[in-house]
Interface confidence: low
C-alpha cells in the first residue's frame, strides 16, 4: 500500500537501530572515501528528520522519495568534487538518473588500506566505552570496502561481532577468545560479500529474469517438497529483495527481507520441514538461518523427469503455449531432484534443454529430435564432476597453501597480463575452495565448489573490467555468468604473451619480511611466484618447485640469522642467480 511518507514508514517498520545501521551502510557504500564521523553526522540528520515525519507525515519534505532525500544529503557534502571527482557530476542529475549515476560510481576495489583489527585490549576498551560507535565503525569500514555487501546480512554480522566482544571482553585472556571467533566471522562475511556481488552482477548484466532463474533452482534444491507455485512465489520475493539491495534501496530491501522471512515461517508446512529452528530465532538471525537452511528431505516418489519433459507427446505444445513457465517447471523439477548439482550446472542444463526445444520443435518429427536430450546432458554434468575430483585430489595432496600456489601458476599462465596483486588475490580465494568444500560429504562438494568458484571469478571479471588487459579474460567474462567457470577452466597457456624481462629487484627481499604475519609472508612468496611465471610462462612445475623451495629455504635461513640484514644482502643476489639458472 502507498504511504504518505516513505521514510516514516521504513523507520516504523525497521526500528531506530536497524534504520540507522542501514542508512550508515547506504552512505558508506555510495561515498567510500568519507570518514566515519562525516557519515555518522549525516545518519543522525536523516534519523532526526525521519522522526519528525513519524510525528507528522505531512511535515515538509516527508513525502519525498528515499532516493531524493538520501541523494540530496550526499550532494550537500562539502568538497565533493575534490574528493570524488566526476562522481560529483551525478548531483547535476534528477532522480532516478542521479541514483543510477551513484551506483555506476561504486568502486569494487577502492584504494583503502586493509581493515586492520586493533589488538584485543584496545578493542575491548573502545567497545565498552561506546558499543554503538564501535559497531558503527565496523559497519562503515566493511560497507565502504564492499559496496554491494548485502545490507541486512551486514547487520547480522555486526550483531555477531557485538556478541563476540560482549563475551570475550569479559574474559581474562581476551586475545585467544577474540581471535578465532572474529576470524570466523571475517571469513564468512568475505564469502557472503563475493556471493552477493555475483547476485548483483547477474541482476545488472542479465536482468531480473536471470536472477529469478537462479533463485528457482536454488530454492527448488532446498525445498523439494514445496510445489512450483510456492517456489515461484518465493523466487519472485527473493528477486525483489535482491534487486532493492543491489540498487541501493537498503531500507526497502531489509524490510522486504523481514517480510519474506515472516512469510516463510508462517507457511512452513507448505515449504519445508526444516525451518522451525530458524523460525524460533530473532529477526536478523532468523533471516540469516533461512538463507542457509539445510535441504529438506526429497519426496520419496518423484517420477522420472523424462515423463513430462521428453516422453509426453505435448512437449512442444506446452513449450509454445508458455515458454517461461514450461522452462521454469523444468528447472524446478530438475533442481529438486538434484541437490547434489551446482546452481550453475542446473542453469546450464536448463539452457541446453531450451536450445534443444527451440531447434527440435521447428522440425518435422520433434520427439525423435529431442528424445536424446537427457543423454546430451551427460558431458555437461561430467565436466564439473571431473573438475571437483581433480581439484580436491590436488588440495588433499598439497594442502591449502600449496593448492593456492598451483592455482596461481595455472591462472598466471592463462592470463599473464593481469596484474600480480589481482592474480594473487584470485588464486588465494580460489584456493580456499579446498578447505571450504573438499572436506564436505561427496554429494555436497559439487554445488559448494562450482558456485563458490563462480563467485570468485565474478570478482576477477569486475576487476578486469576496470582495466582490461587480457583477451582470454575478456572472452570468458563477456559470456553468460553460468558459462564463466567452464570458460576459465578451459583456458590454456596464453601463447600471445611476450614474457616479462627478468628484474632482479622483483626478487630482492629484506629482513622486514621476517616479522610479517604468516599470511603476509605467503602473499610475498606468491607475488614472487606469479612474477616468475610471467618471466617464464612455460616453466615446468618441477622448475617452479625447485625455485620456490630454494626461496623458502633462503627466507628460513636469513630470518634465523644473527645478522639478518647482512644475510639478505649477501644471500639474496645468490638466490636470484640460482633462480635464473634454474629457469634457463
Amino acid at each position: 500500500e502507498a504511504h504518505k511518507s516513505e521514510i516514516a514508514h521504513r523507520y516504523n517498520d525497521l526500528g531506530e537501530q536497524h534504520f540507522k545501521g542501514l542508512v550508515l551502510i547506504a552512505f558508506s557504500q555510495y561515498l567510500q572515501k568519507c570518514s566515519y564521523d562525516e557519515h555518522a553526522k549525516l545518519v543522525q540528520e536523516v534519523t532526526d528528520f525521519a522522526k519528525t515525519c513519524v510525528a507528522d507525515e505531512s511535515a515538509a519534505n516527508c513525502d519525498k522519495s528515499l532516493h531524493t532525500l538520501f541523494g540530496d544529503k550526499l550532494c550537500a557534502i562539502p568538497n565533493l568534487r575534490e574528493n570524488y571527482g566526476e562522481l560529483a557530476d551525478c548531483c547535476t542529475k534528477q532522480e532516478p538518473e542521479r541514483n543510477e549515476c551513484f551506483l555506476q560510481h561504486k568502486d569494487d576495489n577502492p584504494s583503502l588500506p586493509p581493515f586492520e583489527r586493533p589488538e584485543a585490549e584496545a578493542m575491548c576498551t573502545s567497545f565498552k566505552e561506546n558499543p554503538t560507535t564501535f559497531m558503527g565503525h565496523y559497519l562503515h569500514e566493511v560497507a565502504r570496502r564492499h559496496p554491494y555487501f548485502y545490507a541486512p546480512e551486514l547487520l547480522y554480522y555486526a550483531e555477531q561481532y557485538n556478541e563476540i566482544l560482549t563475551q570475550c571482553c569479559a574474559e581474562a585472556d581476551k586475545e585467544s577468545c577474540l581471535t578465532p571467533k572474529l576470524d570466523g566471522v571475517k571469513e564468512k562475511a568475505l564469502v557472503s560479500s563475493v556471493r552477493q556481488r555475483m547476485k548483483c552482477s547477474s541482476m545488472q548484466k542479465f536482468g531480473e529474469r536471470a536472477f529469478k532463474a537462479w533463485a528457482v533452482a536454488r530454492l527448488s534444491q532446498t525445498f523439494p517438497n514445496a510445489d512450483f507455485a510456492e517456489i515461484t512465489k518465493l523466487a519472485t520475493d527473493l528477486t525483489k529483495v535482491n534487486k532493492e539491495c543491489c540498487h541501493g534501496d537498503l531500507l526497502e530491501c531489509a524490510d522486504d527481507r523481514a517480510e519474506l522471512a515472516k512469510y516463510m515461517c508462517e507457511n512452513q508446512a507448505t515449504i519445508s520441514s526444516k525451518l522451525q529452528t530458524c523460525c524460533d530465532k530473532p529477526l536478523l538471525k532468523k533471516a540469516h538461518c533461512l538463507s542457509e537452511v539445510e535441504h529438506d528431505t526429497m519426496p520419496a516418489d518423484l517420477p522420472a523427469i523424462a515423463a513430462d519433459f521428453v516422453e509426453d507427446q505435448e512437449v512442444c505444445k506446452n513449450y509454445a503455449e508458455a515458454k517461461d513457465v514450461f522452462l521454469g517447471t523444468f528447472l524446478y523439477e530438475y533442481s529438486r531432484r538434484h541437490p547434489d548439482y551446482s546452481v550453475s550446472l542446473l542453469l546450464r542444463l536448463a539452457k541446453k534443454y531450451e536450445a534443444t526445444l527451440e531447434k527440435c520443435c521447428a522440425e518435422a518429427n520433434p520427439p525423435a529430435c529431442y528424445g536424446t536430450v537427457l543423454a546430451e546432458f551427460q558431458p555437461l554434468v561430467e565436466e564439473p564432476k571431473n573438475l571437483v575430483k581433480t581439484n580436491c585430489d590436488l588440495y588433499e595432496k598439497l594442502g591449502e597453501y600449496g593448492f593456492q600456489n598451483a592455482i596461481l601458476v595455472r591462472y598466471t599462465q592463462k592470463a599473464p597480463q593481469v596484474s600480480t596483486p589481482t592474480l594473487v588475490e584470485a588464486a588465494r580465494n580460489l584456493g580456499r575452495v579446498g578447505t571450504k568444500c573438499c572436506t564436505l560429504p561427496e554429494d555436497q562438494r559439487l554445488p559448494c565448489v562450482e558456485d563458490y568458484l563462480s563467485a570468485i571469478l565474478n570478482r576477477v571479471c569486475l576487476l578486469h573490467e576496470k582495466t582490461p588487459v587480457s583477451e582470454h579474460v575478456t572472452k570468458c567474462c563477456s559470456g553468460s555468468l553460468v558459462e564463466r567457470r567452464p570458460c576459465f577452466s578451459a583456458l590454456t597457456v596464453d601463447e600471445t604473451y611476450v614474457p616479462k624481462e627478468f628484474k632482479a629487484e622483483t626478487f630482492t627481499f629484506h629482513s622486514d619480511i621476517c616479522t610479517l604475519p604468516e599470511k603476509e609472508k605467503q602473499i610475498k612468496k606468491q607475488t614472487a611466484l606469479a612474477e616468475l611465471v610471467k618471466h617464464k610462462p612455460k616453466a615446468t612445475a618441477e622448475q617452479l618447485k625447485t625455485v620456490m623451495d630454494d626461496f623458502a629455504q633462503f627466507l628460513d635461513t636469513c630470518c634465523k640469522a644473527a645478522d639478518k640484514d647482512t644475510c639478505f644482502s649477501t644471500e639474496g643476489p645468490n638466490l636470484v642467480t640460482r633462480c635464473k639458472d634454474a629457469l634457463a
Epitope: A269, S273, P299, A300, D301
Partner: nanobody, 115 residues
Framework: EVQLVESGGGLVQPGGSLRLSCAAS????????MSWVRQAPGKGPEWVSA????????RYAESVKGRFTISRDNAKKTLYLQMNSLKPEDTAVYYC????????GSQGTQVTVSS
C-alpha cells in the same frame, strides 16, 4: 514402493461431516510434511491443507479454514482430514500427497456433498 491409500469418502448432506484417512507405506512417513489435495470434476487439482512432519504446524486453504482439520499419527503412518460443515462446493476426489505437491499418483477418495 511408495503407497498412499485414501479412505473415508462418501455421500453426505450439506452441513454434515466426514473423516478421511490416508495410510502411507514404503517411505519414512514421520520425516515428511504431508498435504491433502482435491480435484473437482472438470477442474484442476486444488491444495486443501498441509501439516509438517511432526504435526505441530498446519496450514489451510482459505476456502476450508475453520471447517477442516488436518492431523497425523506417525506411529500408525496415517494422515487424517476431519471435514465439518461440508458444502456442495467441497465435492471432489480427495487425495493425500507428500510435501505440498498437487501431482501425486494415488487413487483418492470421492467426497460428494448433496441434498
Amino acid at each position: 514402493e511408495v503407497q498412499l491409500v485414501e479412505s473415508g469418502g462418501g455421500l453426505v448432506q450439506p452441513g454434515g461431516s466426514l473423516r478421511l484417512s490416508c495410510a502411507a507405506s514404503g517411505f519414512t512417513f514421520g520425516s515428511f510434511g504431508m498435504s491433502w489435495v482435491r480435484q473437482a470434476p472438470g477442474k484442476g487439482p486444488e491444495w486443501v491443507s498441509a501439516i509438517d512432519s511432526g504435526g505441530a504446524d498446519t496450514r489451510y486453504a482459505e476456502s476450508v479454514k475453520g471447517r477442516f482439520t488436518i492431523s497425523r499419527d506417525n506411529a500408525k503412518k496415517t494422515l487424517y482430514l476431519q471435514m465439518n460443515s461440508l458444502k456442495p462446493e467441497d465435492t471432489a476426489v480427495y487425495y493425500c500427497t507428500i510435501g505440498r505437491s498437487t501431482s501425486r499418483g494415488s487413487q483418492g477418495t470421492q467426497v460428494t456433498v448433496s441434498s
